[in-house]
């Protein structure tokens, strides 16, 4: 919405535009305005962005407003919150920047008969971007002086220059978000998409054969497994196999059958033939022995002289029987050739959780890190490691330890610094964390361990001459009385300086207002009003632009007027045959010096900026990325070192890119894992992970790598009539008219009539930027004076 | 005073159509999310819909994807479900419910209209 | 999907009893449980939301606790007008799914 708020209002003698008093009658002695002051109101009107202001035309923005809200002077700037001087336009389309704003104070009659008048018009034409931030403007020319501020603020969840932009936080199923003061999401940890409803999956998850509904999940398809779903299901029933692909059983070596259960190296699996045999693989899971001399049997296992090739290990003795032989083991050894280790951890005898290893006639205990001793049944002293950080003492526990922490420290090893910011930095104060402790960095304006004391500004009585101090958060105003100005009421108002006075007349400074002394031809409250001499005075014509008129304020007695027929931009030079010609101030052309010089036509604006036409100037609109006069200037967008984790920038226009070193990814080196964020593609555009890159894909309005670059598309062809410039603003344009033209696409002729330049019954016609007075009986001259 | 009213419900043959409504009222209808809930005769709750403010995303249970449509009309304050090949067990008491932005509870509830799928 | 599981289907208590009722979700869902009570014939209202919230206008004796997979609603002081039937609700992914839902009668 656009807001505007009436702040003061100066009409000392109580005039209204035209001269006249709004309360009836002068005073005959010093011919201030008797009887009531008056009732004014003011009425507001917002348009489209018009370098030269029409006060016609419908106010396409929006028109409003007050009640009556005071009398000649007033000073409402203390009276904040009250809404009687405050004007509110609301709109339901994109805020297009820039504007035009007119704004009339009046006096109402309080009458059915009588019409309101007019006391004062200001005009307004600019640019003003979405902000809590009001801007002051004056109106400081004319019978009336008054002081209004104006701001555009987007409605709640509405971001961007053209409070276009949507984004409501929110956490439940449609997605789990906050929205930065960009207006973009910024997703909750733990998701992820342009609508921050996809979960990430546990960091390793197969991007193929996983997926996940919730965060840090991660559930395999039909025939994958393992943490990370990147192990395939083999056959079922495989033993010797491995799979590729689900369902597999692919054969391990030597190995073979469907189910990889057939040993085809039976001989070298088993080593079957004993006492030096040779073995032959005969076919799956079959074998042969060839024994050596003194030998027999399938596995050669039957000894003719047994006893000769020392069949009992590890020094076991041997005894022949009809058998063969028979061994006697040494301790820790049994077996029929002592070469099988007696398992001594059956049973085990290690305690609490030990592992015990099996040694030769004996065993010995791998005790876990809390328990020590032969069969780990004494509890290990912990705190002989030093495990505590930041703790006062630590405590050995049965099968465990304590660490005492010291104020500010948590976590089994103190180690963990408690954050001490639970939110009691109030004012926007930022919170730092330390131990045991916090420290509110409070933003200007507030002290206070947790900044919530307004620092008094007043405290020091900074203002003069009886000026009274306003506290306000890190600044103070001072409201001063009548007769001084400037930020501490320290100048004495010269209501001289500048000079209201015109036509050359003497200006006479007051205590609280300043007096104009006119030359004869001249009155108003500034001189301003040419007297119609006219009625009472014959006039003759002298050239084709100057007319004599008798006056006694001459020494000849004798008073040349000239003519106006060459605007207000332009001077009469008289030609011979009753002809003139106009001589134009800089910047205007045309026979009544009517067109404004078009400064636009040598394309001064550069790198797509878009030319605006002023009196003898131009102003250029700049494409996203450039600033500067011409918009000559790339403006660096690597200035806030965008790029995280060693990464370099290379400025581009309007955008920035990031060179990536050690593996990091995405638009600012910022992830590990995917190179898109929701920050990497600018207005709405989405973005696709390409694997080393990423790329955007743009929504109508919008081009370039990261969609910031607003497509002249809007633009194209040329959507504004009669040499109207198109400014792009988004998906949308504005457009800026020539002179003589208005409206949002200036398809509508100003009325050049008004108002009322024609004099003594005169009708007006209206031309493009024109218009001609034709005269009543009697009388003649460009405005029928 | 938050008032959702349910209409369009009743008897319909199988393979036929129906289109529910929720009217609602007492709270900006263009600020929340909307939902369908239905509980067929002796038995839970069933989510059916979620439709976002907007309109933009929705949201569908499996048994009725394809058949149903969720929509809204923000300027008339209304919710729709549009039911097509309806089935014996679609028969149930469908509710309309809101939900705020955050946790995706559903704080309202109307008084639900009975939807009868029978030959 | 997120299957929820509640028990018991139902139990008998008399007023006064403190009741207890638990959902278990089939995989972590943080906070994003809500609780309802249904009595027969009307439309369900919300008395938890987010866990352990109680939601405006439910008096204070309902209360809900955990996270993550296990969650519970406890009823403190059982008043004549609790006995119905109390539904689970997960809110974070959808499909949204409601648990079977715990009748509590009067013993």
């Known amino acids: 919405q656009f807001e505007l708020e009436i702040l003061s209002m100066q009409n000392v003698n109580g005039e209204l535009q035209n001269g006249n008093c709004c309360g009836g009658a002068r005073n005959p002695g010093d011919r201030k305005c008797t009887r009531d002051e008056c009732d004014t109101y003011f009425k507001v009107c917002l348009k489209e962005y018009q370098s030269r202001v029409t006060a016609g035309g419908p106010c396409s923005f929006g028109s409003g407003s007050t009640p009556v809200i005071g009398g000649n002077t007033f000073n409402l700037k203390a009276s904040r919150g009250n809404d009687r001087n405050r004007i509110v336009l609301p709109f339901s389309f994109a805020w297009p920047r820039s504007y035009t704003l007119l704004v009339e104070a009046w006096d109402s009659s309080n009458d059915t008969v009588q019409p309101d008048s007019i006391i004062e018009k200001a005009s307004h034409s600019g640019m003003i971007n979405p902000s809590r931030q009001w801007q002051t403007l004056k109106q400081n020319t004319g019978v009336a002086h008054f002081e209004y501020q104006i701001r555009v603020t987007c409605d709640d969840y509405y971001y961007g220059f053209g409070c276009n932009k949507f984004c409501r936080p929110r956490d439940d199923f449609f997605g789990h978000y906050a929205c930065d003061q960009n207006g973009n999401k910024t997703c909750m940890e733990g998701w992820m998409g342009p609508e921050c409803n996809r979960a990430i999956c546990r960091q390793g998850c197969s991007p193929k054969h996983g997926s996940c509904k919730l965060p840090g999940d991660c559930r395999c398809q039909y025939g994958w497994q393992g943490l990370y779903c990147d192990k395939c299901i083999p056959h079922p029933g495989c033993v010797h196999g491995i799979c590729n692909e689900p369902w597999q059983c692919l054969c391990e070596t030597n190995w073979g059958g469907q189910l990889c259960d057939k040993d085809l190296n039976y001989c070298g699996t088993h080593q079957p033939c004993l006492n030096g045999g040779t073995c032959s693989n005969t076919g799956p899971d079959k074998y042969q022995c060839s024994c050596p001399e003194g030998y027999s049997g399938p596995n050669c296992e039957i000894a003719e002289h047994a006893c000769l090739s020392d069949p009992c290990h590890n020094r076991g003795s041997c005894k022949e029987t009809s058998l063969g032989f028979e061994c006697e083991c040494s301790p820790g050894w049994t077996g029929p050739t002592c070469s099988t280790n007696i398992d001594d951890c059956s049973p085990n005898n290690c305690s609490h959780g030990g592992t015990c290893q099996d040694l030769v006639n004996g065993f010995k205990c791998v005790c876990p890190p809390q328990w020590t001793g032969k069969t780990c049944q004494l509890d290990a002293n912990e705190c002989e490691a030093k495990p505590c950080v930041n703790a006062k003492s630590c405590k050995n526990l049965i099968a465990s330890y304590y660490c005492d922490c010291l104020p500010g420290w948590m976590g089994q090893n103190c180690d963990i610094n408690i954050n001490d910011c639970l939110g009691q930095c109030q004012n926007d104060a930022s919170c730092r964390d330390l131990v045991n402790g916090y420290r509110c960095i409070c933003p200007p304006g507030y002290a206070g361990d947790h900044c919530e004391r307004d620092i008094d500004e007043c405290a020091s009585n900074p203002c003069l001459n009886g000026g009274h101090c306003q506290n306000e958060i890190n600044r103070f105003q001072c409201l001063c009385p009548t007769g001084f100005s400037g930020n501490l009421c320290q100048l004495d108002i010269d209501y001289c300086e500048p000079n209201p006075c015109q036509n050359g007349a003497q200006c006479y400074n007051r205590a609280s207002d300043y007096f104009c002394k006119c030359p004869e031809d001249y009155e108003g409250k500034n001189c301003s009003h040419l007297k119609d001499h006219c009625r009472t005075t014959p006039c003759e014509v002298i050239d084709s632009c100057t007319v004599a008129m008798a006056s006694n304020d001459t020494p000849e007695g004798v008073r040349y007027i000239s003519s106006n027929v060459c605007g207000p931009h332009g001077k009469c030079k008289s030609q011979s045959g009753g002809k003139f010609t106009c001589d134009c101030n800089k910047g205007f052309t045309g026979t009544y010096c009517h067109e404004n010089i078009n400064d636009c036509e040598s394309n001064p604006c550069r790198n797509g900026g878009t030319c605006i036409d002023g009196v003898n100037s131009y102003k250029c609109i700049c494409s996203d990325g450039w600033e500067g006069a011409y918009c000559e200037t790339n403006i660096n967008d690597c200035s806030q070192n965008p790029c995280h984790n060693g990464g370099t920038c290379r400025d581009l226009v309007n955008d920035f890119y990031c060179d990536c070193k050690n593996g990091w990814k995405g638009k600012t080196c910022h992830s590990r894992d995917s190179q898109c964020d929701e920050a990497t593609c600018n207005n709405g555009g989405t973005c696709y992970d390409e694997g080393d890159a990423f790329k955007c894909m743009c929504p109508g309005g919008w081009e370039g790598t990261t969609c910031n670059i607003a497509r002249n598309s809007s633009c194209l062809p040329n959507p504004c009539h009669n040499g109207g410039t198109c400014v792009v603003n988004g998906e949308s344009f504005t457009c800026v008219c020539k002179e003589g033209w208005e409206g949002p696409i200036c398809a509508q002729n100003t009325n050049d009539c008004s108002p009322h330049p024609c004099y003594n019954s005169g009708t007006c016609v209206d031309g493009d930027n024109w218009y001609r007075c034709e005269c009543a009986p009697g009388f003649a001259g460009p405005d029928c004076r | 005073e938050v008032q959702l009213l349910e209409s369009g419900g009743g008897l319909v043959q199988p393979g036929g159509s129906l289109r529910l409504s929720c009217a609602a009222s007492?709270?900006?209808?263009?600020?929340?999310?909307m939902s369908w809930v239905r509980q067929a005769p002796g038995k839970g709750l069933e989510w059916v819909s979620s439709?976002?403010?907007?309109?933009?995303?929705?949201y569908y249970a499996d048994s009725v994807k394809g058949r149903f449509t969720i929509s809204r009309d923000n300027s008339k304050n209304t919710l729709y479900l549009q039911m097509n090949s309806l089935r014996a067990e679609d028969t149930a008491v469908y509710y309309c419910?809101?939900?705020?932005?955050?946790?995706?509870?559903?704080?309202?509830w109307g008084q639900g209209t009975l939807v009868t799928v029978s030959s | 999907d997120i299957q929820m599981t509640q028990s018991p289907s139902s139990l008998s208590a008399s007023v006064g009893d403190r009741v207890t009722i638990t959902c278990r979700a089939s995989q972590s869902i943080s906070s994003y449980l809500n609780w309802y009570q249904q009595k027969p014939g009307k439309a369900p209202k919300l008395l938890i939301y987010?866990?352990?919230s109680l939601q405006s206008g439910v008096p204070s004796r309902f209360s809900g606790s955990g996270s993550g997979t296990d969650f519970t609603l406890t009823i403190s002081s059982l008043q004549p007008e609790d006995f119905a039937t109390y539904y689970c609700?997960?809110?974070?992914?959808?499909?949204?799914?409601f648990g079977q839902g715990t009748k509590v009668e009067i013993k």
């Open positions: 419910a809101k939900s705020p932005p955050f946790f995706g509870q559903f704080d309202y």
């Open positions: 439709i976002e403010q907007m309109g933009w995303q929705t």
């Open positions: 609700q997960q809110s974070v992914v959808a499909p949204l799914t």
């Open positions: 987010a866990a352990s």
């Open positions: 007492g709270f900006t209808f263009s600020s929340y999310a």
